[in-house]
Interface confidence: low
């Protein structure tokens, strides 16, 4: 028989988690699970325990997470990478839609995410949606096309800027812009 | 809220021992992982060595590995800092640091200043060759 198969790790509330706030890390295996071994990418920081609580996130806990269980003398393969960033580490860019927040059904919008300092990448979320749009740019003028909107690209968004060299220590996150679609 | 008291510094000869003691108020001891820091004018806080809550693991940094160790006495709400074979180049402010409930509690290694809540005012320790 193989490996066992492999647990899930969580990020409760969220993975994305502002500098002094609490979240908790949650590894879910099968039921009778016997041992966790819940850990830290590229440090020599684990625990034995499914679920780990940090009460108030700091910078040196951002980064990649991964666990994996024991079932008598069998290891399961590891879970899925967690990236754990840590937010507001820098102050925020600002969010702008070009040419404006409000566009037609099958037209054309670019949001565009600036910031002061000199990072090279940026992230973009909408309200809802679990994953950011990440753009790498020379130039500390991110710019995400929306070519032909229809209604689903309407919402809340916002972005973050940080640097290649720290990828887990993202800047608060801009003032929230909304699309209208019309 | 906690406050950190440190004390035991002094002017001691290269070759001598010390003994600082960091005691917190307003909350026990064993409830905090405690941590000691030490920074020399002019150069950047560094690492020393960190006790858990249960004092059940210690670490210490390359640099004082074999003759500084940290213990703590919950019953007496202290955390020690035992200083031997002192070098004048420990000479620095020591300062404690609690951390009210440090993620990955035993496996704590390297310690790092922003993972801790609470600082004390530091004591001088200066060690003349």
């Known amino acids: 028989s193989g490996p066992l198969p492999k647990p899930s790790l969580q990020a409760l509330p969220s993975s994305l988690v502002p500098l002094e706030k609490p979240v908790t890390l949650r590894c879910q295996g099968p039921p009778g699970v016997d041992l966790y071994r819940l850990e830290k990418l590229s440090s020599s920081r684990y625990q034995d325990q499914a679920v780990l609580f940090i009460p108030a996130m700091k910078r040196s806990l951002a980064g990649r997470y991964r666990c994996s269980y024991q079932n008598g003398s069998l290891w399961s393969l590891p879970s899925d990478q967690l990236e754990l960033v840590a937010t507001g580490v820098f102050a925020k860019p600002s969010l702008s839609a070009q040419p404006g927040p409000a566009v037609s059904s099958g037209g054309d919008v670019t949001l565009q995410c600036q910031t002061r300092y000199g990072f090279d990448q940026f992230a973009l979320y909408k309200e809802g949606d679990p994953a950011p749009y990440k753009n790498p740019e020379r130039w500390y003028r991110a710019s995400f096309p929306i070519i032909t909107v229809t209604a689903a690209h309407s919402g809340t968004y916002r972005c973050y800027s940080f640097s290649s060299r720290d990828p887990y220590l993202w800047s608060a996150p801009s003032d929230p812009l909304e699309l209208v679609v019309t | 809220q906690v406050q950190l008291q440190e004390s035991g510094g002094g002017l001691v000869q290269a070759g001598g021992s010390l003994r600082l003691s960091c005691a917190p108020s307003?909350?026990?001891?064993?409830?905090?992982?405690v941590g000691w820091f030490r920074q020399a004018p002019g150069k950047e806080r560094e690492f020393v060595a960190h006790?858990?809550?249960?004092?059940?693991?210690?670490y210490a940094a390359d640099s004082v590995k074999g003759r500084f160790t940290v213990s703590r006495d919950n019953a007496k709400n202290t955390v020690y800092l035992q200083m031997n074979s002192l070098k004048p180049e420990d000479t620095a402010v020591y300062y404690c640091?609690?951390?009210?409930?440090?993620?990955?509690?035993?496996?704590?290694?390297?310690?790092?200043?922003?993972?801790?809540?609470?600082w004390g005012q530091g004591t001088q320790v200066t060690v003349s060759s």
């Open positions: 640091a609690a951390a009210l409930n440090g993620a990955f509690r035993d496996s704590w290694y390297p310690a790092l200043w922003d993972e801790y809540d609470y």
């Open positions: 307003g909350r026990t001891i064993s409830s905090v992982d």
């Open positions: 006790v858990t809550w249960s004092g059940g693991s210690t």
